[in-house]
């Protein structure tokens, strides 16, 4: 059946060195355990994380994300997942696309990650 993919309509913010969490879900909600789910960097289509055949496909990741991502899938049976990026870098800032693929049907949602410097301080005065 058909569905839409919903992601945050606002930038996700994270500090350098911290974790970033990018949520994504399908609408209407349905079990996505058997689907292919992933994130790629837009506009370059570099794979950030890929879940297929019930497993994370680590070998398909772009090298700069290897070992730094985790797909939170406790709620995947409801069609809800979150990509966690650890040890966030300035180079992680930018556009991401989340997609769900069910057989030949695929939908996606774009989102933005803003990375901020925890030590940047503006003098108020």
């Amino acid at each position: 059946g058909q569905f839409r993919v919903i992601g945050p309509g606002y930038p996700i913010r994270a500090l350098v060195g911290d974790e970033a969490e990018l949520p994504c879900r399908i609408s209407p909600g349905k079990n996505a355990t058997g689907m292919e789910v992933g994130w790629y960097r837009s506009p370059f289509s570099r794979v950030v994380h890929l879940y297929r055949n019930g497993k994370d496909q680590d070998a398909e990741q772009a090298p700069e994300y290897r070992g730094r991502t985790e797909l939170l899938k406790e709620t995947i049976s409801e069609g809800k997942v979150t990509l966690r990026i650890q040890n966030v870098r300035f180079s992680d800032e930018g556009g991401y696309t989340c997609f769900f693929r069910d057989h030949s049907y695929q939908e996606e949602a774009a989102m933005e990650l803003k990375v901020e410097d925890p030590f940047y301080w503006v003098n108020p005065g």
């Epitope: 309509g9 606002y10 974790e19 969490e21 994504c24 879900r25 709620t75 809800k80 979150t82």
Partner: antibody, heavy 119, light 107 residues
Framework: QVQLVESGGGLVQPGGSLRLSCAAS????????MNWVRQAPGKGLEWVSA????????YYADSVKGRFTISRDNSKNTLYLQVNSLRAEDTAVYYC????????????WGQGTLVTVSS | EIVMTQSPATLSLSPGERATLSCRAS??????LAWYQQKPGQAPRLLIY???NRATGIPARFSGSGSGTDFTLTISRLEPEDFAVYYC?????????FGQGTRLEIK
């Protein structure tokens, strides 16, 4: 089944403080963002505060910023709202409600706890 | 802050009639729009999410439509238990904001 049970409300004098709690069960608590929503007597719903599943991100309505603090203990499946410097206009039923990642509606709500600010 | 405006404030209808409730956003909220029902002394209950999807357990007589700034909740044939207050809410950007509510009362 999903259950949210608030507690900690009561009668408090202006300027006073309370800590509201929301005990969650029936779902993976840490996977969900949590919210506090309030409703003054005979009035509509007002979103107060939200916290991410990990607790790392918090959000507040302008009307409570600097006075209220939201937190959570994922090991205890409990959400909190510390309310300080209370004013008469904070009198309301306070509900906790869950959402997914800040991109979902509030699909489950608690029954609410009444906070009355009066001298 | 996105302001949500509901109309009418009160709607007086009889059981069996069709109810149409409106919600307008001060700026586009895409499809990040929910409808809730609240009865006296109870917590709100989610009816519709993502503008047009019925929540679990909600009867088919409830339907939602719209996107961007204009949304509608329709109750095709009113049952006695449908008389309550209805709120719309946008969850596309913080602060998440609710409309002021529409009271659906028995005529």
């Amino acid at each position: 089944q999903v259950q949210l049970v608030e507690s900690g409300g009561g009668l408090v004098q202006p300027g006073g403080s309370l800590r509201l709690s929301c005990a969650a069960s029936g779902f993976t608590f840490s996977s969900y963002a949590m919210n506090w929503v309030r409703q003054a007597p005979g009035k509509g719903l007002e979103w107060v505060s939200a916290i991410s599943g990990s607790g790392g991100s918090t959000y507040y309505a302008d009307s409570v910023k600097g006075r209220f603090t939201i937190s959570r203990d994922n090991s205890k499946n409990t959400l909190y709202l510390q309310v300080n410097s209370l004013r008469a206009e904070d009198t309301a039923v306070y509900y906790c409600a869950r959402d997914y990642g800040g991109i979902s509606p509030f699909d489950y709500w608690g029954q609410g706890t009444l906070v009355t600010v009066s001298s | 802050e996105i302001v949500m405006t509901q109309s009418p404030a009160t709607l007086s209808l009889s059981p069996g009639e069709r109810a149409t409730l409106s919600c307008r956003a001060s700026q586009s909220v895409s499809s990040y729009l929910a409808w809730y029902q609240q009865k006296p002394g109870q917590a709100p209950r989610l009816l519709i999410y993502d503008a047009s999807n019925r929540a679990t357990g909600i009867p088919a007589r409830f339907s939602g439509s719209g996107s961007g700034t204009d949304f509608t909740l329709t109750i095709s044939r009113l049952e006695p238990e449908d008389f309550a207050v209805y709120y719309c809410q946008q969850y596309g950007s913080s602060p998440y904001t609710f409309g002021q509510g529409t009271r659906l009362e028995i005529k």
